[in-house]
Interface confidence: low
């Protein structure tokens, strides 16, 4: 047999850890211009703005609403043409800046403000872009809540409103002196119009380990929080198990007098399927890829580099994260490509569920990125690389193994052919992809965020939702709003879509729009007129204004799209790269809606537009609190202006609808909810660049196909004849606020 | 503090043509847009045209009455704007305002006005 | 385009009364309103924007609110110096439009 004798297997060596030195890989030297702000440069940027806004600067860590705190600072990206003399003119780099959002609580007219600082490392000037930017100071209102406002809004809850209805909480849900087996679900927007501040919170058992979203006690507290004094704060409607109610007091008072009817919801602690702690003991060790070689690309701070590709990556603070100066062998295919929004839209039988429209980049896809867990959220043998920030703070802090980098394996031919006609042979090549990924927990949902570079020339852009539903509780006729996952428990349907901004530059800046298609076109059949043919044809179109190129949600698409160059390839046409959705997403938001233009990306599964220094990003940090007057309006951006030989930018939405089922407990799975869409040659190349990839296999069938020098599969005994060195398990830990 | 001032106004044939300035100071004109709008003797108003500033490519727009005879410009350099209207008629006897947008849509400054007569 | 329908067109009213004008949109525009006070041979002037903010300098007895599609401005106690036209204007989309307006005098 080939099992060997039964003995003691023989030490293989440890297969390297780094790559080969001889890698015709390169890692340009501008990699600093698209990198995120170091601790250090964080670190000067917060004592340059200490310096310059004075002692009246609170930590954001413990700011009131009525005090000035610097809310975040981030990369102030370098305008586009500045970068691009840098990079392929070799004009001296564009100043490295910072941008700092700042809160003015205390003073007559409170408002936010944006300053850009700069030049990094050693800040001497401050400019505020809040007019030139937005056209007017922002409202104080927009701001987005600080962790310190939540802390005061649980003082306000647990301590001074929950005792008014100490009975009633008793008898449903086992209160204890101010409500400590509680917790409370923020929602969003907070209210019904611009320049609201009043935030309906859901209360949960707490469930220490397990999923608290699981478990609503039917109480809902709507907070009034818009004014700057926390202690004139209020409650201005209160939902108990379906009814309304004005107060906590008149709650207890309707429990006393026996005409509340109340439910009894068990706190049934961690032991249930809401847990994440399998009843199963471990098993064999699933699947490892290894690197037998060494990995076969680099990463050099933000800068990732492979035989193939090129490319910087980063993570907004709040939209998330991003990738600049794609190249593909050398050549640049993508200036930028960033998410820049997400949305979850919620229906359901309580004001919580009905209202929710959770604009995440209001909270913040890069705040809330999550450390990686080695060996689930990535391969076990991936790069992790971390993510200085300083957001809510007066110091950086570091999110650890905030992203991951590694090559895999599709276990999937890329392309393939197996011959028995005429003549014998096999040519095929196994897609290995590189691939970058960072992950984010808003609430009780995680986000999974995936670049997919091909052998193929292709990008591939895939976000997944997994983590806990958000729930309700389950009373009245709930079959419109979700499906029932527990006794007392309402899966709510919701639906979640992102926002992709993709600057492609295909064979250079000055891009057109081709739109192709298929018809069938009726004709006789011209050895035989008396019979017709349906014969499928070809339809193009150059689209030469924005409107034309702006495809609403459930609009006929067509379904191939590129932006194309001037330039043709060898066999006379356009050089071009098309945008291939994959998306299911449900029904926007109705325009008559007074919120919808908080989030107007939502409509248009795609748009291209002319690319503006002005409009970096179809959404804001400001857009969640207040969605009624938004500060980014995407549907702005589309006013019918040519797109015939510009710079372009595709904006592409990516979604899904989601009802709730048993399966999605403890949580919902990626299988089936990841969408997104691919960037892919067409005509871009002269044929599939992959043929010239050195992991190419092809033999005749006279050939000796197990001969090391004929089929390079054959060599792997002994090339790959190592073990991979495993390093020990680490956790990024948790973060405490 | 914001000042704006209207000139160019008077009586004009029917068919004939006018050119409206409007000089400003006061404020930092490149941060805004600026806009016309006229009110008819003893009318209401009627927005008449706009023009944002160089951050949105100087883009321009128009109420649908003048459309095609009316074009508005400004001059960052002596934060000034102007309106051209060609064809003019009758029913254009106006007050023409010059004002600021803040916030992008609302008109916080007026000018005092000048007026426009078209008569034969 | 979004019609703008203001009522009354005209009013009278005693100092130190209340007074009420209401301006009906023709389609959803949010929050998206401002209301304009012209005093005779005078040019306009913002009071209140996004329906319910006012203006700097503005004094607190005016105030705006919204239901739906229609919106009120409201003079808690009518002074001489309020005495002109008031104007509201529809900024969600353009063409931007005004109401006809309403011509408030003293009783």
């Known amino acids: 047999g080939r099992g060997g004798d039964g003995g003691e297997p023989s030490q293989l060596p440890h297969c390297p850890s780094v790559s080969p030195s001889a890698q015709p890989w390169t890692h340009p030297g501008q990699s600093q211009l698209f990198a995120d702000l170091s601790r250090e440069e964080l670190t000067a940027v917060m004592r340059f703005l200490t310096q310059r806004l004075g002692p009246g600067l609170v930590d954001a860590a413990q700011a009131r609403p009525s005090d000035n705190c610097v809310f975040s600072v981030e990369l102030q990206l370098p305008p586009k043409a500045a970068a691009l003399a840098h990079l392929d003119r070799g004009s001296p780099p564009p100043a490295r800046e910072a941008l700092a959002i700042v809160f003015f609580g205390r003073q007559p007219q409170p408002n936010v403000s944006e300053l850009v600082v700069g030049p990094l490392p050693h800040p001497s000037y401050m400019r505020d872009v809040t007019v030139e930017r937005h056209g007017g100071p922002l409202p104080y209102h927009r701001r987005p809540v600080l962790f310190q406002e939540y802390l005061d809004i649980d003082q306000m809850i647990f301590n001074r409103e929950l005792p008014q209805a100490s009975g009633l909480l008793h008898h449903c849900c086992f209160y204890k002196h101010r409500g400590r087996n509680l917790v409370t679900m923020t929602t969003a927007p907070r209210g019904l119009q611009s320049g609201d501040r009043a935030t309906w919170f859901g209360l949960y058992y707490n469930i220490s380990g397990a999923g608290f979203f699981l478990h609503h006690v039917g109480l809902e507290l709507l907070v009034n929080h818009k004014a700057l004094d926390p202690a004139r704060w209020t409650i201005q409607k209160v939902f108990y198990q379906g009814r309304y109610y004005d107060s906590l007091a008149q709650l207890e008072a309707q429990f006393e007098a026996g005409l509340v009817n109340v439910v009894l919801i068990p706190d049934n602690g961690t032991g249930g399927s809401w847990s994440l702690k399998s009843p199963v003991p471990p098993g064999p060790a699933p699947p490892l890829q290894f690197y037998p070689q060494g990995p076969r690309f680099s990463v050099q701070g933000s800068r990732v580099a492979s035989s193939l590709w090129t490319f910087s990556f980063g993570l907004g603070a709040f939209s998330g994260p991003r990738i600049f100066d794609v190249r593909f062998q050398g050549e640049r295919l993508v200036y930028e490509i960033s998410l820049q929004e997400a949305l979850a839209i919620y229906g359901g039988n309580s004001p919580a569920a009905m209202t929710t429209r959770y604009v995440d980049g209001g909270f913040g896809m890069g705040k809330y990125t999550t450390p990686l867990t080695r060996g689930v959220d990535c391969p076990y043998l991936a790069t992790y690389v971390d993510w200085h920030f300083l957001l809510e703070s007066q110091a950086p802090k570091t999110i650890r193994d905030a992203f991951c980098v590694f090559e895999q394996n599709q276990g999937l031919p890329l392309r393939r052919h197996h011959s028995d006609l005429y003549s014998h042979y096999f040519g095929g090549l196994a897609e290995t992809v590189l691939v970058v990924r960072s992950m984010s927990t808003l609430l009780n949902y995680d986000y999974v965020w995936d670049t997919v570079f091909h052998p193929s020339g292709a990008i591939e852009i895939r976000f997944y939702a997994t983590g806990y539903i958000s729930s309700a509780f389950l009373f009245g006729a709930t079959g419109k709003y979700g499906n029932q996952v527990s006794e007392h428990t309402l899966g709510t349907v919701h639906t979640h879509s992102a926002h992709f901004k993709v600057d492609l530059d295909v064979a250079g800046l000055e891009n057109w729009v081709w739109a192709e298609d298929m018809v069938f076109v009726p004709m006789a059949v011209p050895w035989s007129p008396e019979h017709q043919l349906q014969r499928l044809q070809v339809t193009r179109k150059l689209l030469e204004m924005e409107e034309q190129a702006a495809f609403l949600v459930g609009s006929a698409t067509p379904r191939y799209l590129y932006l194309a160059s001037n330039h043709s390839n060898k066999w006379g046409h356009p050089r071009g790269y098309r945008i291939q959705m994959l998306s299911f997403a449900g029904e926007p938001l109705p325009q008559n809606s007074s919120m919808a233009r908080g989030f107007s990306w939502e409509r248009y599964q795609l748009a291209v537009t002319q690319r503006k220094e002005e409009e970096p990003s179809s959404s804001s940090v400001f857009n969640q609190n207040d969605p009624w007057a938004p500060t980014v309006d995407f549907s702005d951006f589309i006013n019918n202006e040519t797109i015939a030989g510009k710079d372009l930018v595709a904006w592409v939405t990516a979604g899904f609808l989601h009802i709730p089922h048993a399966e999605d407990i403890p949580n919902t799975v990626t299988v089936g909810n990841g969408v997104g869409f691919f960037l892919r040659p067409y005509n871009f190349f002269d044929e599939d660049p992959s043929f010239y990839s050195a992991d190419s296999i092809y033999f005749r069938g006279d050939q000796d196909a197990g001969a090391c020098e004929v089929n390079p599969l054959a060599c792997l005994p002994q090339a790959a004849a190592c073990a991979p060195d495993l390093p020990a398990f680490s956790h990024g830990g948790f973060s405490h606020n | 503090e914001v000042q704006i001032l209207e000139t160019g106004g008077g009586l004009v044939k029917p068919g004939g043509s006018l050119r409206l300035s409007c000089a400003t100071s006061g404020f930092n004109f490149n941060d805004y847009f600026m806009n016309w709008v006229r009110q008819a003797p003893g009318k209401g108003l009627e927005w008449v045209a706009q023009?944002?500033?160089?951050?949105?490519?100087?883009?321009?727009y128009y109420g649908e009455s003048l459309e095609g005879r009316v074009t508005i410009s400004r001059d960052d350099s002596k934060s000034n704007v102007y309106l051209q209207v060609n064809s003019l008629r009758p029913e254009d006897t106006a007050i023409y305002y010059c004002?600021?947008?803040?916030?992008?849509?609302?008109?916080?400054?007026w000018g005092p006005g000048t007026m426009v007569t078209v008569s034969s | 385009d979004i019609q703008m329908t203001q009522s009354p067109a005209s009013l009278s009213a005693s100092l130190e009364e209340i007074v009420t004008i209401t301006c009906q949109a023709s389609q959803d525009i949010g929050n998206w309103l401002a209301w304009y006070q012209q005093k005779p041979g005078k040019s306009p002037q913002l009071l209140i924007y996004?329906?319910?903010t006012l203006a700097d300098g503005v004094p607190s007895r005016f105030s705006g609110s919204r239901s739906g599609t229609q919106f009120s401005l409201k003079i808690s106690r009518l002074q001489v110096e309020d005495i002109g036209i008031y104007y509201c204007?529809?900024?969600?989309?353009?063409?931007?439009?005004f109401g006809g307006g309403t011509n408030l005098e003293l009783k």
């Open positions: 996004d329906a319910t």
């Open positions: 004002s600021r947008s803040s916030y992008l849509r609302y008109f916080d400054f």
């Open positions: 023009i944002r500033n160089k951050h949105y490519n100087y883009a321009t």
């Open positions: 204007q529809q900024a969600s989309s353009a063409p931007w439009t």
